[in-house]
Structures are given as structure tokens and as C-alpha cells.
Amino acid sequence: MAVTACQGLGFVVSLIGIAGIIAATCMDQWSTQDLYNNPVTAVFNYQGLWRSCVRESSGFTECRGYFTLLGLPAMLQAVRALMIVGIVLGAIGLLVSIFALKCIRIGSMEDSAKANMTLTSGIMFIVSGLCAIAGVSVFANMLVTNFWMSTANMYTGMGGMVQTVQTRYTFGAALFVGWVAGGLTLIGGVMMCIACRGLAPEETNYKAVSYHASGHSVAYKPGGFKASTGFGSNTKNKKIYDGGARTEDEVQSYPSKHDYV
């Protein structure tokens, strides 16, 4: 029961997190005009990953897309990439985790298969969350750097006769949405990985047994799902999630619930 709750909660938290990552990626307020200690402009500028907007005091808002790909800063492209990778991984993770949910029955899917799928989706959520957090943090760092550069320009660039109203940008709402959403996705992923431990079948003392069907043979191995599907993790993953490093042969010969973690 606790495992189902942990898995279900992990799924819901990740779902909210991924929705948040998508929302943050689409939002226009990644950076907003800094109004503190600034000549008060009658227009309010804000920028997103895909377009920049200007809101006049009347409420009239005009947005312009970044219609160039090569002309954009490399950092902005990197942030876009990180956010998209995060969304894609999260979406795949959600798809996998739906089938992995203990409360959903699909044919005669074994618990070992569900455990593997839960682990896979958990890892995907963790990576998705990290991508979002990294993307938002890179953008935030870019803003901080530009903010102090423009602040320096404000106080050094007064030599000429004609001045420009310096527009400085500070953190927009999307950054906070992104950080929170990334964190939620990460937490959801960890919960899925924890749930995976409890989903794996209890330790058994028999080795793999082959059952021969008519015409061709299909091997059903307790704990062998890892070897026969794409959802399993390799020996490297064993070292990360398991206490000990064993060979694949040992894994298949002596299955235990820890092999699924």
C-alpha cells in the first residue's frame, strides 16, 4: 500500500512538475525590466525564450518573436535546448510511469517489469528536473552578469551629451516557476525510484527456469526482465543504485529484490 502511494504521489508530483516546466518554457517573463532605482519608463519590457514583449502604460502589449536562430546568444540557445530536453524526457517518463503504476493492470505484466519501468521513469524525471533547473539557472546567471554590466555602464557611460535610458533586466516569474517545477519533477523522480524498491518481487532461491512453448521457446526468468527489455538498467546502473557491483551472470543467477533498484 505504501509503495503504491509513493509511486502514485511520485507520478502526480512529477506530472505537476513537468506541467510547470512546459509552462515556464512557454512563458514570456523570463526576464523583466528592472524598475528599481531606474528612470521610470512609461513602457515595461519583458522577455521570454521565444519572444520579447513591451507593455505600454495603457495596457497595450506588443510581442515580437525571435525570428532568427543564428543571431541569438549561444546561452539562450543552450537554455532552450535544456528546457526542451527536460520536457521531452519528462513526457516520455510520464508515458512510461503510467504503464508502471501498480494500480493500473495491463495484461499479465509482472511486478518486475513494473519495477523496471518505475525506475526508468524515475530516472527520466530526475534528469528532466535537473535539465529544467540547469536551464533556469544558466539564464539567471546570464541575467545577473548582464545586470551588473549594464549597471556599470549606467555610471560610466555618462560622458557623452546624449544619454540612453538603460533598460536593465531582472528575474522574471518564469524563472521561479522553472525552479519550483524542476524541483518538483526531481522530487517526483526520487519518489518513483524509492517506489521501485518496494515493487520488485521478494527474494527467491530458485534459478531461472525455461518453459517451452510450441514451436519456439520463450524464457521466463524471475528477475530477468532487465535482460530482455529496453527498460532495464545495465551494470553501470547497478553500481549507482545497488550496494554491490556484480556481473550480469550473477544478477541472473541469484535474483534478489535489490537488483531492481
Epitope: 512609461a42 513602457v43 519590457n45 505600454e56 495603457s58
Partner: antibody, heavy 120, light 113 residues
Framework: QVQLKQSGAELVRPGASVKLSCKTS????????IHWIKQRSGQGLEWIAK????????YYNEKFKGKATLTADKSSSAAYMQLSSLKSEDSAVYFC?????????????WGQGSSVTVSS | DIVMTQSPSSLTVTAGEKVTMSCKSS????????????LTWYQQKPGQPPKLLIY???TRESGVPDRFTGSGSGTDFTLTIDSVQAEDLAVYYC?????????FGGGTNLEIK
């Protein structure tokens, strides 16, 4: 059609106060900024302040802070400007005007002006 | 505050002539976010309130004759009247609509011979 009707001419003593009104019609009063502009006889225009009637939010020209106070009455769709501690240099025509939507913060409709004369 | 300087302060022309008046701002009125200049032109006829002619430095207000053209960017702006008519007798003001407080130029008084 959009109309802004201002109160009539005022003759006031130095040190006194005066409250000018600007009654609007023909549009949704609460969703457009109302600006107040001063014009001394034969001189240029001077921006005083503006108010957003929907929220009562205001922006003042530092020069007129303490001199002008802007208010708005949603029920009567009227904007008001109170001028206090009047001096001879406050003698001028005061215009109220509506800020247009999507017109680069420009004012597109003006009242006819209220003349204020400060004299002892 | 942004200082708006208009020149000439007075101008006398013959009907049908082309007129150009200038407006300079002490700071740029260009907003990079939407690539627009927040400069407005008004026409004030004697005994009347000002009338909006041009906003965003070059966008003509509806109902304004197309002989009125606004141009310029950053700090230098121009209002051109292609073929002056008798009814164009007025004072023309430019206004900074980019920062608070909004500031007006001293005006250009257009007189017709």
C-alpha cells in the same frame, strides 16, 4: 463619442485650494488613464500627473507633488485634481486628457480646459 | 528629466509650401523591445486644446491628413507638413512619452503668410 468636459473658470485667492473636475463619457472610464496638463498663458505645455481610475494608481511629476492631488470617482466617471497652496504662478489653463490604447502612451482626447486665476 | 528642444520656435510660410520642424531629446526615446520611438506630436490651434497628430514618432493618428509626416529615431525627430494649408496655423508640440515625467518641447509656432 469620447468626451471630456471640464469645470469652469476659477478665480481664487493666494494660499487657497481649488478642485477641478473632468467628467468623461463615451468610453469605459475605469480602463483608461487620465492625464492632467498645465498651460500658462502664451506658454508651453507641462505634464502634471496621471491617474488610472480603475485602481486609483497615480504617477506624478516630482515638480507637482504636494501641489496637485488626483482622484477619480468611478460612479460618476469623473476625474478630479485638487491644487493646494495656490500662488500666482499656478495661474494657468489646466487640461485633462485621456491616454489612448496602443498609441505609444499618447493622449488622444482632451478636455476643453479649466482656467485658474490666482489673484488677491 | 528628459529635455525636449524644438526648433525653430516660430515659422512663417506661404500656403502650399513644405514645412519641416525639428525636435531633439536629451535622451534616446527608442525602446529596443519593440523597436519604437516614444515621441508624440500635437497640434494646438488658438483657443483650443491640443490635438494628437502623430505617435510612435511616425504613426499618424486616424483622421489626420496624410500631408503630416513624422520621422526620426533616437534623439532627433522631424515633423513635415507637405503642402501647408491655411487651417494648419497652430503651435506644434513634441512630447516625450518614454519616461516619467512626460515632457513637452517649447513648441513651434506656425504662421501662414
Amino acid at each position: 463619442q469620447v468626451q471630456l468636459k471640464q469645470s469652469g473658470a476659477e478665480l481664487v485667492r493666494p494660499g487657497a485650494s481649488v478642485k477641478l473636475s473632468c467628467k468623461t463619457s463615451g468610453y469605459t472610464f475605469t480602463t483608461f488613464w487620465i492625464h492632467w496638463i498645465k498651460q500658462r498663458s502664451g506658454q508651453g505645455l507641462e505634464w502634471i500627473a496621471k491617474i488610472y481610475p480603475g485602481t486609483g494608481y497615480t504617477y506624478y511629476n516630482e515638480k507637482f507633488k504636494g501641489k496637485a492631488t488626483l482622484t477619480a470617482d468611478k460612479s460618476s466617471s469623473a476625474a478630479y485634481m485638487q491644487l493646494s497652496s495656490l500662488k500666482s504662478e499656478d495661474s494657468a489653463v489646466y487640461f485633462c486628457a485621456r491616454e489612448g490604447y496602443g498609441k505609444g502612451n499618447a493622449v488622444d482626447f482632451w478636455g476643453q480646459g479649466s482656467s485658474v486665476t490666482v489673484s488677491s | 528629466d528628459i529635455v525636449m528642444t524644438q526648433s525653430p520656435s516660430s515659422l512663417t510660410v506661404t500656403a502650399g509650401e513644405k514645412v519641416t520642424m525639428s525636435c531633439k531629446s536629451s535622451q534616446s526615446l527608442f525602446n529596443s523591445g519593440n523597436q519604437k520611438n516614444y515621441l508624440t506630436w500635437y497640434q494646438q490651434k488658438p483657443g483650443q486644446p491640443p490635438k494628437l497628430l502623430i505617435y510612435w514618432a511616425s504613426t499618424r493618428e486616424s483622421g489626420v491628413p496624410d500631408r503630416f509626416t513624422g520621422s526620426g529615431s533616437g534623439t532627433d525627430f522631424t515633423l513635415t507638413i507637405d503642402s501647408v494649408q491655411a487651417e494648419d496655423l497652430a503651435v506644434y508640440y513634441c512630447q516625450n512619452d518614454y519616461t516619467y515625467p512626460s515632457t513637452f518641447g517649447g513648441g513651434t509656432n506656425l504662421e501662414i503668410k
